[in-house]
């Protein structure tokens, strides 16, 4: 806490200038006026103040703001925003896209702090829901948000701001992420034609379901191996050699590589070894000739 | 071993409506996509519709799109064709396949459908 | 739509004949190229898929080869049984279609 002292003869700030990085804390606080402060905040930025300065500064709104910072203050704090903290942010009620760009530019290179953590969870909250202008914003600065939002909290995305994904903003999500994405992105994208409908699909594949596989596999996409690879494990192992090779298309040669690893091994698993053999490719590893294969699902609903 | 038997069809006046079945056996229903090919008495084969394992897919020729329908009901292991506002051109046996990924692999004995007045 | 042509149209051959039938697709099908026989008054039954791949149960004197947009069924030594209706289909692109036929008839 700053000792309250009386601002010396002449020191009295008239506005927020370059004059005032050569004011001593205390001066700081006795001579610069917390109304004057909140009014000329886009003038702070541009001037460098010690991190003791921006103390001081702080300190100044807070006093004059207990309830939390408005609007018209939080679009201009700059670099001042560094030295909020998560319990300060809870105050604020961000309304603003230009207000939520202008502080995440602040911290912009940078691991999401939790101040940033608690800005956006605030920004969202008061939307209602994670709009497509947002979520193109909060994956430019942050290309793994969304993946770092729970899936009840992926449940509020609109349909509509699945367009603003891009693949690298999936990069690091999970099965249960990828599961609430995908049927949105079905949805968003489902007028599109076969080709282009792959294209913006595709990053989301790891949350399809069989049927919606087998469904690819009528549209000549040529699914690359590494998407393949991707896929949910319970999804792949009720297609057919038949749907796997019109699935993958020319990539169907690069299951080889992969048979020693999830889903193709346990595909694999799945299939009848002479119906494995018609790809030509060795893959070893399934259900011999003449055996019979048990469907335990029917079992296990009929017990 | 895998078995698929048609019923439904018969006589019908053009404008009509009809409905075929197709009850399958051998295999595990709900894992396969599902077909319906007609042939017209002495020409050759034509695809009239798929449908999705799970039902939530459903693929035509133009020739039938907006007046044939095809649908299952996994519960009963069954393929269903309705057809509405029937021509003379839809005279044809009707047969039921099974569909894997690119290949009519199964078929039933067929069920002939006679549009006429 | 892609259009199938096969040819001949119908073709007469004796027991133990070596036959052969082609399917044209209009554009590239890739390998997604399938092979049927009919029998008069019977169902169609699966030959060969993927061009060269022979069902089960299918006597190993069927063969089938073939890329792109020609392709071809061998019968290397016709037999009794085998007198039929053959259809190719393409499996490459909706909608799905069929060859015309051809006939193999007995001489």
């Known amino acids: 806490e700053v000792e309250k002292t009386a601002c010396p003869s002449g020191k009295k700030a008239r506005e927020i200038d370059e004059s005032l990085i050569f004011y001593k804390k205390w001066e700081l606080e006795a001579c610069v006026d917390a109304a004057l402060l909140a009014t000329q905040m886009d003038r702070v930025n541009a001037i460098p103040f010690t991190y003791e300065q921006l103390d001081v500064l702080k300190h100044k709104l807070d006093e004059l703001y207990p309830q939390g910072y408005p609007e018209s203050v939080i679009q201009h704090l700059g670099y001042l925003f560094l030295k909020m903290s998560p319990e300060d942010i809870r105050k604020w009620n961000v309304t603003s896209l230009e207000t939520l760009k202008a502080l995440l530019e602040v911290n912009k290179g940078h691991e999401m702090s939790p101040q940033v953590a608690t800005l956006i969870d605030r920004f969202v909250k008061g939307r209602g829901q994670l709009d497509k202008d947002t979520l193109d914003t909060l994956t430019a600065f942050y290309p793994g948000y969304l993946c770092s939002l729970s899936p009840e909290e992926l449940s509020s995305v609109p349909p509509s701001s699945i367009w603003a994904v891009r693949p690298q903003d999936l990069d690091t999500c999970d099965p249960r992420q990828l599961d609430v994405l995908y049927p949105k992105a079905r949805l968003a994208f489902q007028n599109m034609n076969g080709s282009e409908y792959f294209v913006k699909i595709q990053s989301f594949l790891g949350g399809a379901p069989t049927e919606d596989l087998k469904a690819l596999s009528q549209q000549n996409v040529s699914m690359d191996l590494a998407t393949f690879m991707k896929l949910r494990t319970d999804a792949v192992l009720p297609l057919t050699v038949a749907e796997v090779q019109k699935l993958l298309g020319p990539h169907v040669e690069g299951l080889k590589a992969e048979e020693r690893h999830r889903p193709v091994r346990d595909w694999i698993l799945r299939q009848r070894q002479d119906d494995l053999d018609t790809l030509g490719l060795g893959l070893q590893g399934g259900i011999p000739n003449g055996y019979l294969v048990l469907d335990l699902s029917m079992q296990e609903a009929l017990s | 071993e895998v078995q698929l038997v048609e019923s439904g069809g018969g006589l019908v006046q053009p404008g009509g409506s009809l409905r075929l079945s197709c009850a399958a056996s051998?295999?595990?229903?709900?894992?396969?996509?599902m077909s319906w090919v007609r042939q017209a008495p002495g020409k050759g084969l034509e695809w009239v519709a798929t449908?999705?394992?799970?039902?939530?897919?459903?693929y035509y020729p133009d020739s039938v799109k907006g007046r044939f329908t095809i649908s299952r009901d996994n519960s009963k292991n069954t393929l269903y064709l309705q057809m509405n506002s029937l021509r003379a051109e839809d005279t044809a046996v009707y047969y039921c396949?099974?569909?894997?990924?690119?290949?009519?692999?199964?078929w039933g004995q067929g069920t002939l459908v006679t549009v006429s007045s | 739509d892609i259009q199938m042509t096969q040819s001949p149209s119908s073709l007469s051959a004796s027991v133990g004949d070596r036959v052969t039938i082609t399917c044209r697709a209009s554009?590239?099908?890739?390998?997604?190229l399938n092979w049927y026989q009919q029998k008069p008054g019977k169902a169609p039954k699966l030959l060969i898929y993927?061009?060269?791949r022979l069902h089960s149960g299918v006597p190993s004197r069927f063969s089938g080869s073939g890329s792109g947009t020609d392709f071809t069924l061998t019968i290397s030594s016709l037999q009794p049984e085998d007198f039929a209706t053959y259809y190719c289909?393409?499996?490459?692109?909706?909608?799905?279609?069929f060859g015309q036929g051809t006939k193999v008839e007995i001489k």
């Open positions: 396949a099974r569909f894997d990924g690119y290949i009519f692999d199964y």
């Open positions: 051998g295999f595990t229903f709900s894992d396969y996509f």
């Open positions: 449908i999705s394992n799970g039902g939530t897919y459903t």
């Open positions: 554009q590239d099908i890739s390998n997604y």
């Open positions: 993927y061009t060269s």
């Open positions: 289909q393409q499996g490459n692109t909706l909608p799905w279609t």
